[in-house]
């Protein structure tokens, strides 16, 4: 697994413990919480990152304050169960035996139940809408420049194949990034749109998951793009199953 060999760190995930104890003294990195070996040449799965976050040092919460323009939204933080590949298990339960089904990005997609609840398969989130509102600027950003910059960001920073960035919409001050990735489209080695969206969300909050990189310094033609609100919507290949009671509440 690719890790920075000289000082044995994981460039793509700072929530890891790395040691030169791999084969032949090679640097090997394991995710906090799960202890699973991670591939430091690509993004770590959201499930392993959430699990790591639950067991990270308290300093990770007290010393990293969300950036001034990041609204603290409901993170949906819980200690998830991940499968051997690092993906979310379809059924998640808490310590009090309350269970629910999740999609591939770990978001609840059914009502909560007990241990008898069945989640037959992990339903794929194939469409993610990232809604951003930027801080006021002298004028609107040029749409094509903004589009190019955000596509470059997802390609270079998150290693997401450009074909999965379906569209970038802009109506000042709102930006909407559409990520699409069907099961059939995702080849081995492709970064998952859910993982890319999670890294982006943490970057926007000033809580970068990358080792040794500051937060995002997003610029469009030299003009800083500062995000003051983020909302992320997830659409699954199979619609979620919530009771009408919840939908009318």
């Amino acid at each position: 697994h690719t890790a920075a060999q000289d000082n044995c760190t994981c460039p793509t995930n700072k929530m890891t413990v790395c040691s030169p104890d791999g084969p032949g003294g090679r640097c090997q990195c394991r995710a906090l919480g799960s202890g699973m070996a991670v591939d430091c040449s690509t993004l770590t799965s959201k499930c392993l990152l959430l699990k790591a976050r639950m067991s990270a040092p308290k300093n990770a919460r007290t010393l990293v304050r969300p950036s001034e323009h990041a609204l603290v939204d409901n993170d949906g933080l819980y200690d998830p169960d991940c499968d051997p590949e690092g993906r979310f298990k379809a059924r998640q339960c808490n310590q009090t035996s309350v269970c629910w089904c999740v999609n591939s990005v770990g978001v609840r997609r059914t009502d909560k139940g007990d241990l008898s609840l069945r989640c037959d398969e992990l339903v794929r989130t194939h469409h993610i809408l990232i809604d951003l509102r930027h801080r006021p600027t002298a004028g609107a950003f040029n749409h094509s420049d903004l589009d190019a910059e955000l596509r470059r960001l997802f390609r270079e920073r998150y290693r997401l194949h450009p074909k999965f960035v379906a569209a970038v919409h802009y109506e000042q001050p709102t930006i909407q990034i559409e990520l699409r990735q069907n099961t059939s489209q995702k080849a081995a080695g492709d970064v998952d749109i859910g993982d890319a969206a999670y890294y982006f969300e943490r970057d926007i909050k000033g809580e970068s998951l990358f080792q040794g990189r500051g937060g995002l310094d997003l610029r469009v033609r030299g003009e800083p793009l500062q995000v003051e609100r983020t909302l992320i919507y997830y659409l699954d290949e199979i619609p979620p199953k919530f009771s009408m009671k919840r939908l009318t509440a």
Epitope: T9, T16, P57, V64, E68, G206, F210, Q211, G214, G215
Partner: antibody, heavy 118, light 106 residues
Framework: QVQLVQSGAEVKKPGASVKVSCKAS????????MNWVKQAPGQGLEWIGI????????TYSQKFQGKVTITVDKSTSTVYMELSSLRSEDTAVYYC???????????WGQGTTVTVSS | DIQMTQSPSSLSASVGDRVTITCQAS??????LAWYQKKPGKAPKLLIH???NLQTGVPSRFSGSGSGTDFTFTISSLQPEDIATYYC????????FGQGTKLEIK
């Protein structure tokens, strides 16, 4: 190769202030936290405070609150520690240390001796 | 604030001896403990992080173990160049060093 280079030794009178610098090179400056650690003569190591160069946020040990101010100049990849109202007990070697991803200190400066004497 | 109690404060051993230093935290710090070697006039050097993970380039005679509140640092076969003061550091909730253990050759 990561390097933290600190400013030279200082001799100050009681009541004065001193500003020690720590210049980082060899890695992304804003991607790591920076800490200051004190070692008084014949004593152990004491953590003073931390700064996140990306946002400029600081957190201080309760013991050094009001005594120390940590600042950053991102343009020169330099972190500063200012000690005010100096007293003889501030005589020590002060180290800057980089916080790794999980915050333990992986690289250290060479140390700066501050002597407070009338 | 978390207190770290390190013992012994000083220790005399012969070359080739097995040396053990302990550190006790006043509350659970998971495995967020590092060990440093400090020689006079030199900056501290990171030996071990996350309780037992050897920093790159550090000889394998150094090791660490423990979890929660009780931690141990071991030098399996003392070498002359190991003469130094050793410190533990908890980095779970802010940062606290142990008082240090001065290691001398008999």
């Amino acid at each position: 190769q990561v390097q933290l280079v600190q400013s030279g030794a200082e001799v100050k009178k009681p009541g004065a202030s001193v500003k020690v610098s720590c210049k980082a090179s060899g890695s992304s400056f804003t991607g790591y936290t920076m800490n200051w650690v004190k070692q008084a003569p014949g004593q152990g190591l004491e953590w003073i405070g931390i700064i996140n160069p990306y946002q400029g946020d600081t957190t201080y040990s309760q013991k050094f609150q009001g005594k120390v101010t940590i600042t950053v100049d991102k343009s020169t990849s330099t972190v500063y520690m200012e000690l005010s109202s100096l007293r003889s007990e501030d005589t020590a070697v002060y180290y800057c240390a980089r916080g790794a991803g999980l915050y333990y200190f992986d690289y250290w400066g060479q140390g700066t001796t501050v002597t407070v004497s009338s | 604030d978390i207190q770290m109690t390190q013992s012994p404060s000083s220790l005399s051993a012969s070359v080739g001896d097995r040396v053990t230093i302990t550190c006790q935290a006043s509350q659970d710090i998971n495995k967020y403990l590092a060990w440093y070697q400090k020689k006079p006039g030199k900056a501290p050097k990171l030996l071990i992080h996350y309780t037992s993970n050897l920093q790159t380039g550090v000889p394998s005679r150094f090791s660490g173990s423990g979890s929660g509140t009780d931690f141990t640092f071991t030098i399996s076969s003392l070498q002359p160049e190991d003469i130094a003061t050793y410190y533990c550091l908890q980095y779970d909730d802010l940062f606290t060093f142990g008082q240090g253990t001065k290691l001398e050759i008999k």
